[in-house]
């Protein structure tokens, strides 16, 4: 029973942790401008993985994709290549472990297919869960690395009399969706292969046999033995449009000029 | 068609505050900002803030904070604007006007005239 | 706050003449996301409201004629009025959108000889 309901959990978590990944690498903000100690402008900014997207004040947004493959930074399309990766095997792994799910029955699958399995699917959610959170970490690795640079600039480009205002960027919320999402993978794949354990049969227990040879008396039991590991590798893509920041009211997408009532 | 419809003259006593209305038509006037213009006579233009009809929020120029007061009314889809403890330096011309593409001022109202006089 | 610093304070034309006025800002207007200046150009004539001309500094609002044109970018802006007509003697502001407070030019007063 516990078993069962550590897969099940196990499932239920990489799964939310799954649909998190997927929205993360969609949202549009991975990197939002920064607002602290800086002029409160009018217009503000902020970028994903697919696309930059600028919000007036007035409500207007518009989005640009990035449609060029060459001209982005190596780091930008390796965090994509990561969570692709994890969305993948993430999904995999998915498809893998409905089909290990001890509630479900299909044919005559024996126990212990179920639990290679489900240990198939909890490696795949853990790498998964690995892929994203790398992915999100070298993305506010660069992120901070930037925000130090264009800081170091604000204070030393300030020669001449015309100021310029610096666009900072910060970490956005897709960042702590795949945090957080990565982690659920991560957890929802240890839970699996913990599950794993408990679903492996036990080798069959054969009574002891005794046998009696010259005045020695030698007990043999065959005994069990388990193991096994391994990794896999993630993801997906599908793309959201993700309007906002500040206040809902105030941040309404409208694509003409003019509303006629 | 678009209207912002503002009454044309309010004669006001020196430390009397006065509340301006600016009633918004014609449009889906929760989803533009109001905002509140200020021109002396034979003078420029000067922002004052402006009030999203949806959230009530409200965005001032520092200047103004102390001056101006911005409200409205969703069910009338009126904004208000009151000035306190009014002198001869506030005696303008006051537009309201709705922020559109490019933060720009689209729409105006016709003003109020505002003389501050005993 | 932004300074607009706008030039000649007023212009004497003759109708059908080509008319150029500047604007220039304290600050860079021009917004690194999506590449626009928002700088905005109103006329205000005698006893009217301001009507809106030019936003992201080149864009012509609609309904207004053709001979009206914006440039520029950064911290340096033009209008240029390509043929003016009698009826477009009026006060001619900028306008910064880009940073709060919002803030305006002192105006160009445009003229007939």
């Known amino acids: 029973m516990a078993v069962t309901a550590c897969q099940g959990l196990g499932f239920v978590v990489s799964l939310i942790g799954i649909a998190g990944i997927i929205a993360a690498t969609c949202m549009d903000q991975w990197s939002t401008q920064d607002l602290y100690n800086n002029p409160v402008t009018a217009v503000f900014n902020y970028q994903g993985l697919w696309r930059s997207c600028v919000r007036e004040s007035s409500g207007f947004t518009e989005c640009r994709g990035y449609f060029t493959l060459l001209g982005l930074p190596a780091m930008l399309q390796a965090v994509r290549a990561l969570m692709i990766v994890g969305i993948v095997l993430g999904a995999i792994g998915l498809l893998v472990s409905i089909f290990a799910l001890k509630c479900i029955r299909i044919g005559s699958m024996e126990d212990s297919a179920k639990a290679n399995m489900t240990l198939t699917s909890g490696i795949m959610f853990i790498v998964s869960g690995l892929c994203a959170i790398a992915g999100v970490s070298v993305f506010a690795n660069m992120l901070v690395t930037n925000f130090w640079m264009s800081t170091a600039n604000m204070y030393t480009g300030m020669g001449g009399m015309v100021q310029t205002v610096q666009t900072r960027y910060t970490f956005g919320a897709a960042l702590f969706v795949g945090w957080v999402a990565g982690g659920l993978t991560l957890i929802g794949g240890v839970m699996m292969c913990i599950a794993c354990r408990g679903l492996a049969p036990e080798e069959t227990n054969y009574k002891a046999v005794s046998y009696h040879a010259s005045g020695h008396s030698v007990a043999y039991k065959p005994g069990g033995f388990k193991a096994s590991t391994g990794f896999g590798s993630n993801t997906k893509n599908k793309k959201i449009y993700d309007g906002g920041a500040r206040t809902e009211d105030e941040v309404q997408s409208y694509p003409s000029k003019h509303d006629y009532v | 068609q678009v209207q912002l419809q503002q009454p044309g003259a309010e004669l006001v006593k020196p430390g009397a505050s006065v509340k301006l209305s600016c009633k918004a038509s014609?449009?889906?006037?929760?989803?533009?900002?109001i905002q509140w213009v200020k021109q002396r006579p034979g003078q420029g233009l000067e922002w004052i803030g402006m009030?999203?009809?949806?959230?009530?929020?409200?965005n001032y120029n520092e200047k103004f904070k102390k001056k101006a007061a911005l409200t409205l009314d969703k069910s009338s889809s009126t904004a208000y604007m009151q000035l306190s403890s009014p002198t001869s330096e506030d005696s303008a011309v006051y537009y309201c006007?709705?922020?559109?593409?490019?933060?720009?001022?689209?729409?105006w109202g016709q003003g109020t005239s505002v003389t501050v006089s005993s | 706050d932004i300074v607009m610093t706008q030039s000649p304070s007023s212009l004497t034309v003759t109708a059908g003449e080509k008319v150029t006025m500047s604007c220039k800002s304290s600050?860079?207007?021009?917004?690194?996301?999506?590449?626009?200046?928002?700088l905005t150009w109103y006329q205000q004539k005698p006893g009217q409201p301001p009507k809106l001309l030019i936003y992201?500094?080149?864009t012509r609002e609609s309904g207004v004629p053709d001979r009206f044109t914006g440039s520029g970018s950064g911290t340096d802006f033009t209008l240029t009025i390509s043929s003016v007509q009698a009826e477009d003697l009026a006060v001619y502001y900028c306008?910064?959108?880009?940073?709060?407070?919002?803030?305006f030019g002192a105006g160009t007063k445009l003229e007939l000889r």
């Open positions: 006007v709705r922020m559109g593409l490019g933060n720009a001022m689209d729409f």
């Open positions: 014609g449009y889906t006037v929760t989803r533009y900002w």
């Open positions: 009030i999203h009809p949806n959230s009530g929020s409200t």
């Open positions: 600050q860079s207007l021009l917004n690194s996301g999506n590449q626009k200046n928002y």
């Open positions: 992201w500094a080149s």
């Open positions: 306008q910064n959108n880009y940073v709060y407070p919002l803030t």
